[in-house]
Amino acid sequence: MRRGPRSLRGRDAPAPTPCVPAECFDLLVRACVACGLLRTPRPKPAGASSPAPRTALQPQE
C-alpha cells in the first residue's frame, strides 16, 4: 500500500459535493466515480502503521 497523508485534520474536510458515499469526486473529469477507480488511500491491515482514519466526508473530496 502507498504511504498516506501524515494527518487528516478536521479543517481538511472537503466542501459538500454531489457524490454518494460509495463514490469519490474525480477532479479531472469533474464527476463522481466509484472510489475504486481512483488511487485513494486505503486502510492497511491491522497492526500496520497507518494514517488517521478517513472520515465519512473524505471520499467526496
Epitope: F25, L37, L38, R39, T40, P59, E61
Partner: antibody, heavy 118, light 113 residues
Framework: DVQLQESGPSLVKPSQTLSLTCSVT????????WNWIRKFPGNKLEYMGY???????YYNPSLKSRISITRDTSKNQFYLQLLSVTTEDTATYYC????????????WGAGTLVTVSS | DIVMTQTPLSLPVSLGDQASISCRSS???????????LHWYLQKPGQSPKLLIY???NRFSGVPDRFSGSGSGTDFTLKISRVEAEDLGVYFC??????????FGSGTKLEIK
Amino acid sequence: DVQLQESGPSLVKPSQTLSLTCSVTGDSITSGYWNWIRKFPGNKLEYMGYISYSGSTYYNPSLKSRISITRDTSKNQFYLQLLSVTTEDTATYYCAGLDGLYWYFDVWGAGTLVTVSS
Amino acid sequence: DIVMTQTPLSLPVSLGDQASISCRSSQSLVHSNGNTYLHWYLQKPGQSPKLLIYKVSNRFSGVPDRFSGSGSGTDFTLKISRVEAEDLGVYFCSQSTHVPPFTFGSGTKLEIK
C-alpha cells in the same frame, strides 16, 4: 509499496521518435491516473499528459500532436511516444502516479535522461 | 494554463538558518469544492521529486515538522525553520486545482551559503 520504473533509449536522433515504458508494480494501472512529466536542464518541470483508469488520455497542448500515451494492462505498463524530437526535447523523463484524494503526485519513477543529438 | 511563479530561484542559506520560498499563482487556487490544491515537492540531487506538503499546509508522512506551508488564494509560502544538510535540493510548488494540465513553479535551489 507502489514502484515505477522508466525504461527506453537514452539517446535519440533529431526527427526520430522517443519511446519510453513505465513499468508499475504494487498497484494496477486500471485504477487512477498515470502520468508523464519531464524536467529540462535548468530545472523546469513540464507536465506532458496522462492515461486514466478507463484508458482515456490527456496531452498537454504545448506538445501539439507529437505525443501519444498508451498502456498494456496485462503487463501493467504504460508508454510514452514523442514524435519528431528536436534537441529541445532533451530532458529527464519521469512517470508518476496521482493520488486521487488530494491530487498530488505521490509516487515517481527514478527518471531517465533522454538526450536528443545526432 | 495556470502560471506558477516561484521566488527566489536560488536561496543560499547557512545550516540552522530559516529559509522561506514564495509561490504565486496566476489565478486563485481555491477549487469550487472549497479545497486549495497547492503542493510542494523537494527534488534532492540525483533523485526524483518527493512530496513534502499537500493542500497548502499538510505535511506528508515522514516529513519533519521543521517544514511548514501557508498561504491562500494566489500567494503561498514554504518555510524551513532550521535548515539541515539533507534539505538541500530544488523545491517546486505545484497546483492541481485548474487541471489539466498540472503546472509547476520554476523551482528554488536551496544551497549552502
